[in-house]
């Protein structure tokens, strides 16, 4: 009998409000035994996969997706899904990345360290398990 897969979570380091040209890392988390994590952008047609998974805790695994130099075009909604044989999980909630001008002045808003909730996170559409592994022909239009 197939197990029910828990929904992944998504967070961003150092936060979800990133100065232009700075880096951001999306962190996806799921159960132990995930083979592939996928970070989706806005819709399923644009995504990145990774199999470089490590332990987040005894019961959780995580994967990291780094954008070295954030551009305005990187702003938008991101979410994670994962593949744990024999199926894909549901999507995580959406996380919204905001890109700000890097004025660096005292009035510029702080980033939100480790933010994974709050007003920038939107519920997913819950249309899940319709994905196929990238190796089965779904084309990846890479995020960065």
């Amino acid at each position: 009998q197939e197990e029910d897969l828990p929904r992944p979570s998504i967070s961003a380091e150092p936060g979800t409000v990133i100065p232009l040209g700075s880096h951001v890392t999306f962190v996806c988390r799921g159960p132990v035994g995930v083979q592939t994590f996928r970070l989706e952008r806005d819709s399923r047609s644009t995504y990145n996969d990774t199999e470089d998974v490590s332990q987040a805790s005894p019961s959780e695994s995580e994967a990291r997706f780094r954008i070295d130099s954030v551009r305005e075009g990187n702003a938008g909604l991101y979410r994670c899904i994962y593949y744990k044989p024999p199926k894909w999980s549901e999507q995580s909630d959406y996380l919204e990345l905001l890109v700000k001008e890097s004025s660096g002045g005292p009035d510029s808003p702080d980033t939100e360290p480790g933010s994974s909730a709050g007003p920038t996170q939107r519920p997913s559409d819950n249309s899940h398990n319709e994905h196929a592994p990238a190796s089965q022909g779904l084309k990846a239009e890479h995020l960065y």
């Epitope: 035994g33 996969d49 199999e51 332990q55 005894p58």
Partner: antibody, heavy 119, light 107 residues
Framework: EVQLVESGGGLVQPKGSLKLSCAAS????????MNWVRQAPGKGLEWVAR??????????YYADSVKDRFIISRDDSENMVYLQMNNLKTEDTAIYYC??????????WGQGTTLTVSS | DIQMTQSPASQSASLGESVTITCLAS??????LAWYQQKPGRSPQLLIY???SLADGVPSRFSGSGSGTKFSFKINSLQAEDFVSYYC?????????FGSGTKLEIK
């Protein structure tokens, strides 16, 4: 088909150096962490080193027995992983396997290359 | 470092029998445990990952169980090709330590 082909093994004198290579094909190399594992003659398996992907800053990790002597590296443009071994000791004599890490587990192993350290 | 204590070091069994190998971790590793099979002169092959998940193409007579610090690996209905060596490994934290191995021999 996933393939990992090691090369570069041979006979080296104690305190000598050698560089092992591993050519990867048949999978998306730059999304996988890679490892080296060794097996001394008639002995069990010993994990040696790991290198992560670009999103993880190509972080490297080593067994205590090889720390400060061995260096793992990778070339994503050539689908290659390397193990530079310096100040070799007789106890480094082993078969060295290049191993793919998928989802946190060692799922695919090369055929191995043999290193003999002897005077 | 996490120590992995695997037992027995060797075990004799007959064709068609079942055998169980155990692996104890020196600290909790959740289910970050794998089991490998190694045939003489060959590379190891992943059998079980995440303590209980069967790797692709592995026969269902192989199974794994356990979490935390105590893990078991079972082979049902032993076949001639199963009389080789088996290793456990923790992948919770580096260094990724292996158990010392179990050699299965035909009785």
């Amino acid at each position: 088909e996933v393939q990992l082909v090691e090369s570069g093994g041979g006979l080296v004198q104690p305190k000598g150096s050698l560089k092992l290579s591993c050519a990867a094909s048949g999978f998306s190399f730059n999304t996988h962490a890679m490892n080296w594992v060794r097996q001394a003659p008639g002995k069990g398996l010993e994990w040696v080193a790991r290198i992560r992907t670009k999103s993880n800053n190509y972080a490297t990790y080593y067994a205590d027995s090889v720390k400060d002597r061995f260096i793992i590296s990778r070339d994503d443009s050539e689908n290659m992983v390397y193990l530079q071994m310096n100040n070799l000791k007789t106890e480094d004599t082993a078969i060295y396997y290049c191993v793919r890490l998928r989802g946190g587990f060692l799922d695919y192993w090369g055929q191995g290359t043999t290193l003999t350290v002897s005077s | 470092d996490i120590q992995m204590t695997q037992s027995p070091a060797s075990q004799s069994a007959s064709l068609g029998e079942s055998v169980t190998i155990t692996c104890l971790a020196s600290q909790t590793i959740g289910t970050w445990l794998a089991w490998y099979q190694q045939k003489p002169g060959r590379s190891p092959q992943l059998l079980i990952y995440a303590a209980t998940s069967l790797a692709d193409g592995v026969p269902s007579r192989f199974s794994g169980s356990g979490s935390g610090t105590k893990f078991s690996f079972k082979i049902n209905s032993l076949q001639a090709e199963d009389f080789v060596s088996y290793y456990c490994q923790q992948l919770y934290s580096t260094p990724f330590t292996f158990g010392s191995g179990t050699k299965l021999e035909i009785k």
